[in-house]
Each structure stands twice: as C-alpha cells, then as structure tokens.
C-alpha cells in the first residue's frame, strides 16, 4: 500500500497505474472506523497482486481530497486509466472486496 | 443471526410475469450486494445477476438481460427478482444470496417457479 | 465470461477412498470458490479462496490449485460426502460450473 502525500504523486500513481486498477483509501488517523478497515485494506493488498492501492490521509492531502470531492471517512474511491469508475463510504469490508473484484 | 427467507413457491403460466421477494434479517442489505441464482431441476447453478441496494446499481449476465429484473426496497430489507415472458426454460427454484469472500456466505431457502398453461 | 469446466461429470467412491475432482477455468482466475449441495437443500459455501476450509467443514476437505486449474480433494470418504460440488469463481461475471456429483460405493 502506497502512502500519497501530494497531489503530484497522486496523479504519478494513477499514471503509473496503465490498465491495472487502482483503490485509493481516504482516511485520517482520528477516524475511528478507518482504523478498523485499515489491516483489512492491507491485507486485500496482499490478496490482489495485480491491484494497486494508495491510501490519501485527507489532513496530510486536502487538495488531493478536495479535489476528488471526500465528503467523510473513509471514503474508496476506484480509478482506471485515471478515471474514477467507482466510489463508497463505510468501512465496508464485504463491498470493498466485492468492487475490486468486480473491477480488476 | 443473518437470515435470507424468500417467497413461497408460483405456478404462472406461459407469457406472464412473476415477482420473487428476499427479505433479509441480521444484517442490512444496503451493506453488501445481493445476488439471484438459478437452478433447473436436476441442474446445476446460474448467476443471474446482483444489485447495489444501496444506490441501486445492478449488473446481470448478459444470458438474462431482458428476462430478469432485480430491485431492492431498503426500508423493508428486501431484494426481488422480477421474471419476464415466461416459458418452460424460466421453471426452475432461483436463490437468492449473500455471496461474501468469506468462510461464511448465505442463501435463501429456495423459491421454486413452475410455468405451465 | 470465464466457463468452469468440472471434471468428472459423476464418481463413486467407497468410504475410506480418496477423493479428486477438479474444475478448469477458461482463463486465469484469481481464487476459486466450491459448494456443496444436497437434494432439496441450498447450496453451502465449502472451500473459498482457494483452499481454505468455511466453517463446520470437515478437516478431510481440502482445496488447491492456481491460474485455470483447480482441484477439491477428499482424504477419505464419508458416506456423508455423497453430495454433488460446483466449483464458482467470481469475477466481474461470477459463474459456476455444472457440477460433480459425488455418490457412495
């Protein structure tokens, strides 16, 4: 898991991507249920090899998370090819892993 | 405990249109994505297509685009498959379920569609 | 659409006897998923991703296999086994295969 700490490594990363999916966590560390998500997040890193995941701290990365439009946490938001093609709030296990295997 | 219980069983005949209900209990269906699956006697299993009760989103394999139609009401919990120009083919039970990555997934019991004039 | 494609279609086995039968994915598929299911029962989730064991499943069960080639192996046979197994992998089209049932010599 790729820890983004600005909006040019963002888009690096979603350029970097090509083809493959990408799953970005926004969080922050006084987010209680994105705490609970984050060794699940991890561990589905792990899992889907050929996924990439970012994690956006969205008090480290306002602009990044500004411009995406987070309105609460945590929020996944799923690129390909540098467009979004899915979005969720909750740490929602079930559903994050039905949507990436949905889409990678 | 987390409970998916269906409708009872149709008998409905050649052309018309049916409705199959999927209440669930122990959980909220706005949490994951609900599935039907089809089964013909003595047959093996079909995924016919899931929704997103959340926003309503649904996909469904190309095989029953057309002849299958999955809702979702929120407020009571429950998933429906609405079944289409009915003919022998539709006889069947279809499922409907929970299918999680998980050590545990779940299903209903079962509701059995038999089309005859 | 990714087939799955079981392998055999039907077997016999004897209590005591060892177990195989595999499923064949048209192409690559990251984790395998299988369920058993009895006459006029609902499927059970059985072995998911891959190998590991849903609960209340015997320890006699196991799952293997990787890419487009996979297997469910059953050390020593039961007579509660008897039952018929669809494989099922759930990508962005999830499908299952037509099934191997399993009865008792």
């Known amino acids: 898991v790729k820890q983004i700490e600005s909006k040019t490594a963002f888009q690096e990363a979603l350029d970097a991507a090509g083809d493959k999916l990408v799953v970005v966590d926004f969080s922050a560390t006084w987010c209680g249920p994105c705490k609970m998500i984050k060794p699940f997040f991890h561990s589905l890193s792990e899992k889907y090899s050929n996924v990439i995941f970012l994690e956006v701290d969205v008090d480290d990365c306002q602009d990044v998370a500004s411009e995406c439009e987070v309105k609460c946490m945590p929020t996944f938001q799923f690129f390909k090819k540098g467009q979004k093609v899915g979005e969720f709030s909750g740490a929602n296990k079930e559903k994050l892993e039905a949507i990436i295997n949905e889409l990678c | 405990e987390v409970q998916l219980q269906q409708s009872g069983a149709e008998l409905v005949k050649p052309g018309a249109s049916v409705k199959l209900s999927c209440t669930a209990s122990?959980?909220?269906?706005?949490?994951?994505?609900m599935h039907w699956v089809k089964q013909r006697p003595e047959q093996g299993l079909e995924w016919i297509g899931r929704?997103?009760?959340?926003?309503?989103?649904?996909k469904y394999d190309p095989k029953f685009q057309g002849k299958a139609t999955i809702t979702a009401d929120t407020s009571s919990n429950t998933a429906y498959l609405q079944l289409s120009s009915l003919t022998s083919e539709d006889t069947a039970v279809y499922y409907c379920?929970?299918?999680?990555?998980?050590?545990?997934?779940?299903w209903g019991q079962g509701t059995s569609v038999t089309v005859s004039s | 659409q990714i087939v799955l494609t079981q392998s055999p279609a039907i077997m016999s086995a004897s209590p005591g006897e060892k177990v195989t039968m595999t499923c064949s994915a048209s192409?690559?598929?990251?984790?395998m998923y299988w369920y058993q299911q009895k006459p006029g029962t609902s499927p059970k989730r059985w072995i998911y991703?891959?190998?590991k064991l849903a609960s209340g499943v015997p320890a006699r069960f196991s799952g293997s296999g990787s890419g487009t080639s996979y297997s469910l192996t059953i050390s020593t046979m039961e007579a509660e086994d008897a039952a018929t197994y669809y494989c099922?992998?759930?990508?962005?089209?999830?499908?299952f295969g037509a099934g191997t049932k399993l009865e008792l010599k």
């Open positions: 379920a929970l299918l999680q990555y998980s050590a545990m997934d779940y």
């Open positions: 122990g959980f909220n269906i706005k949490d994951t994505f």
């Open positions: 929704i997103d009760p959340a926003n309503g989103n649904t």
């Open positions: 192409s690559r598929i990251s984790y």
């Open positions: 991703d891959t190998s």
């Open positions: 099922h992998q759930r990508s962005s089209y999830p499908t």
